[in-house]
C-alpha cells in the first residue's frame, strides 16, 4: 500500500519521493532494506537522503533494490517503500515498456505533454523534447514550462515522447531523461437521433418451444462519447425488472462499441426454456438518448422442430 | 501563488449523495497531503481527515468513516470529498486545507445545504 | 482525542489595547522528537476561511504582522495582540495540530468596542 515503482538510467540523476507524507518540520530517515543500513544525509555521498527525498547522483544499476523511508511524527512513524530500479542505458533508439510513464492523450484542442517527474528535479529551462528519439523542430511545437504544446494535433503526432534536462546539485550538473507514450483522440464527436440497426421493424423471430432463445437490441447515437444514451427491452409496454418473470432476463453486451467511429449499445433479451404464451407478448427494443427515442417491436413464433423420423 | 479553488455550493436532499472538489495550483500537487475540515453554521471547526496526494490514501477522522470518502485526481491536481445518503447535520461549509505545519492555504470553502 | 479549551469564549476591547487569550489541551503538545510544539492559531471573519497566524505554538506565518504573538509549550498556550486594530475583529481558533485526529477549540470572539 506505502510503496511506489520508481526507475531511471545509469548515469543519470534520479530522485525519488518517500510514499508517506507528513508536515515539513518531521524528520525522515531512509535505510536501504537489504541491508538495514541508514542512507546518509552529507551530500558529498553519491547517493545521499534530504528529507522526504532520496537522490541518485548519479544512479548506478547495483543502486537497484528497494528502499524504506520513515517519517517521524509525534504520534507514531510512518513507514513506507521505494522500490527503485536501476537499467542500463539501450544502444539503440527503442524504448522499452519497463521505462515508460503513465500514457497521455491529446486532442486537437488539448495537446500538453507533461515531462514525469521533472518536479521532483532543480532544473532550469529548456526543456529538450525528442520524439521516436528525433529532436522536435518546427514552429508546431513549443517547450513552456515542464510541458510540451503540439499545434493542430494530428494522428501522426502518436508515438514515444521523451523530455530530456538538466539536474543542478550544488554546481555540479547531472543529465535525466523520462519517456511516455502519447496518444491522439478524435474530438469531434457528435450525437444524432437513435439508429437501431437490430432489430428490424416488427421483425419475426422464430423460436423453439422449450429451448432458450436470445434477441440483441443494438443502437448507435452519435460519434464520440454520448452524455446519455441507454437501449433496453419492454415486454408488452412494461420493463423486463417489473414484468416479473424469472425466465426473462436483459444483460447488457458491449458497451459503447465503436465501429467505424459510431458509438453504439447492445442489449441482449435472454429468454429460458421459452413457452408458448411467450408467443403473445410484444417485445419492444428501445433507444434514446437526449434527441428522443425509437422502438423496434418483435414477435416470437414457433419454429417447428426438424421431423428426424421417416 | 499558491491556491486552493473549490466547487460551488449545493443544494440537496436527504438521502442524495454530493462530491465536492479542490483544485490546488501554484505548487507540486503530490508534495502535501490535503486535509477537509467542516464548519457548520455558527459552529466551530472539526477536523475530517485527509488525503495522502502522492499515493492517494485517505485518513478519515472518527466522526467521519462511512457515509465520506475522500478521492484524488493527480492529473487535475484536484481532491474530492464525496458524502452519500446526505442527513440534515451535513449542512455546513466544507473546507480543503493544504497540510503543512499548521494549514497555511485553505479553499474558500463549499456550502452544502441539505433540506427536504 | 485531544481537547482544546479555549478561553474567554468572547471579549470586547478598545482599539489599541492589548489582548491575551488562552489555549490548553488535554495532552502535551510538544513532540520531544524535534521540540516542537505542534499548535496552531487561526484568525477566521466572516464568509472566510480561517488564516494561519501561528504555527509550532509561537513562529509567525509569512505576512501576519508582528502584533499577533504566540507563546506557551506542552499545554498551555496563548496568543497575544500587542495593539488591536478594528479588522481584527474576527474568531480566534487554536488548532491541535500534533496527533489525529486534528482538533480545533471552540473559538474565541473578539468583539471591538
Known amino acids: 500500500k506505502f510503496s511506489k515503482q520508481s526507475w531511471g538510467l545509469e548515469n543519470e540523476a534520479l530522485i525519488v519521493r518517500c510514499p508517506r507524507q507528513g508536515k515539513p518540520s518531521y524528520t525522515v530517515d531512509w535505510y536501504y532494506s537489504q541491508t538495514n543500513k541508514s542512507i546518509p544525509t552529507q551530500e558529498r555521498n553519491r547517493v545521499f537522503a534530504s528529507g522526504q527525498l532520496l537522490k541518485f547522483l548519479p544512479a548506478a544499476v547495483a543502486d537497484s533494490g528497494i528502499y524504506t523511508c520513515i517519517v517521524r511524527s509525534p504520534t507514531f512513524n510512518r513507514t513506507g517503500y521505494a522500490n527503485v530500479t536501476i537499467y542500463k542505458k539501450q544502444s539503440d533508439c527503442n524504448v522499452p515498456d519497463y521505462l515508460m510513464y503513465s500514457t497521455v492523450s491529446g486532442s486537437e484542442k488539448n495537446s500538453k505533454i507533461y515531462c514525469p517527474t521533472i518536479d521532483l528535479y532543480n532544473w532550469t529551462a529548456p526543456l529538450e523534447w525528442f520524439k521516436n528519439c528525433q529532436a522536435l523542430q518546427g514552429s508546431r511545437y513549443r517547450a513552456h514550462k515542464s510541458f510540451l504544446v503540439i499545434d493542430n494535433v494530428m494522428t501522426e503526432d502518436a508515438g514515444d515522447y521523451t523530455c530530456k534536462f538538466i539536474h543542478n546539485e550544488n554546481g555540479a550538473n547531472y543529465s535525466v531523461t523520462a519517456t511516455r507514450s502519447f496518444t491522439v483522440k478524435d474530438e469531434q464527436g457528435f450525437s444524432l437521433f437513435p439508429v437501431i440497426g437490430a432489430p428490424a421493424q416488427n421483425e419475426i423471430k422464430e423460436v423453439e418451444i422449450g429451448k432458450n432463445a436470445n434477441l440483441t437490441c443494438s443502437a448507435c447515437f452519435g460519434k464520440g462519447t454520448q452524455f446519455l444514451a441507454a437501449v433496453l427491452w419492454q415486454l408488452n409496454g412494461t420493463k423486463i425488472t417489473d414484468f416479473g418473470e424469472p425466465r426473462i432476463q436483459q444483460e447488457e453486451g458491449q458497451n459503447q462499441s465503436f465501429s467505424n467511429g459510431l458509438a453504439c449499445l447492445d442489449m441482449v433479451l435472454r429468454i429460458a426454456d421459452v413457452k408458448e404464451e411467450d408467443l403473445l407478448l410484444q417485445y419492444d427494443c428501445l433507444a434514446l438518448n437526449l434527441h428522443g427515442l425509437r422502438r423496434h417491436t418483435v414477435r416470437l413464433s414457433r419454429k417447428n422442430p426438424i421431423d428426424h423420423h421417416s | 501563488q499558491i491556491q486552493l479553488a473549490q466547487s460551488g455550493p449545493e443544494l440537496k436532499k436527504p438521502g442524495e449523495t454530493v462530491k465536492i472538489s479542490c483544485k490546488a495550483s501554484g505548487y507540486t500537487f503530490i508534495n502535501y497531503g490535503m486535509n477537509w475540515v467542516k464548519q457548520a453554521p455558527g459552529k466551530d471547526l472539526k477536523w475530517m481527515g485527509w488525503?495522502?496526494?502522492?499515493?492517494?490514501?485517505?485518513t478519515y477522522g472518527d466522526n467521519f468513516k462511512g457515509r465520506f470518502a475522500f478521492s484524488l485526481e493527480t492529473s487535475a491536481s484536484t481532491v474530492y470529498l464525496q458524502i452519500n445518503n446526505l442527513k440534515n447535520e451535513d449542512t455546513a461549509t466544507y473546507f480543503c486545507a493544504r497540510e503543512g505545519d499548521g494549514f497555511a492555504y485553505w479553499g474558500q470553502g463549499t456550502l452544502v445545504t441539505v433540506s427536504a | 482525542d485531544i481537547v482544546m479549551t479555549q478561553s474567554p469564549p468572547s471579549l470586547s476591547v478598545s482599539v489599541g489595547e492589548k489582548v491575551t487569550m488562552s489555549c490548553k489541551s488535554s495532552?502535551?503538545?510538544?513532540?520531544?522528537?524535534?521540540?516542537?510544539?505542534?499548535l496552531a492559531w487561526y484568525q477566521q471573519k466572516p464568509g472566510q476561511p480561517p488564516k494561519l497566524l501561528i504555527y509550532?505554538?509561537?513562529t509567525r506565518e509569512s505576512g501576519v504582522p508582528d502584533r499577533f504573538t504566540g507563546s506557551g509549550s506542552g499545554t498551555d498556550f496563548t496568543l497575544t495582540i500587542s495593539s488591536v486594530q478594528a479588522e481584527d475583529l474576527a474568531v480566534y481558533y487554536c488548532?491541535?495540530?500534533?496527533?489525529?485526529?486534528?482538533?480545533f477549540g471552540g473559538g474565541t470572539k473578539l468583539e471591538i468596542k
Open positions: 509550532g505554538a509561537s
Open positions: 488548532q491541535n495540530d500534533h496527533s489525529y485526529p486534528y482538533t
Open positions: 495532552q502535551s503538545l510538544l513532540y520531544s522528537g524535534n521540540q516542537n510544539n505542534y
Open positions: 488525503i495522502n496526494t502522492y499515493i492517494g490514501e485517505p
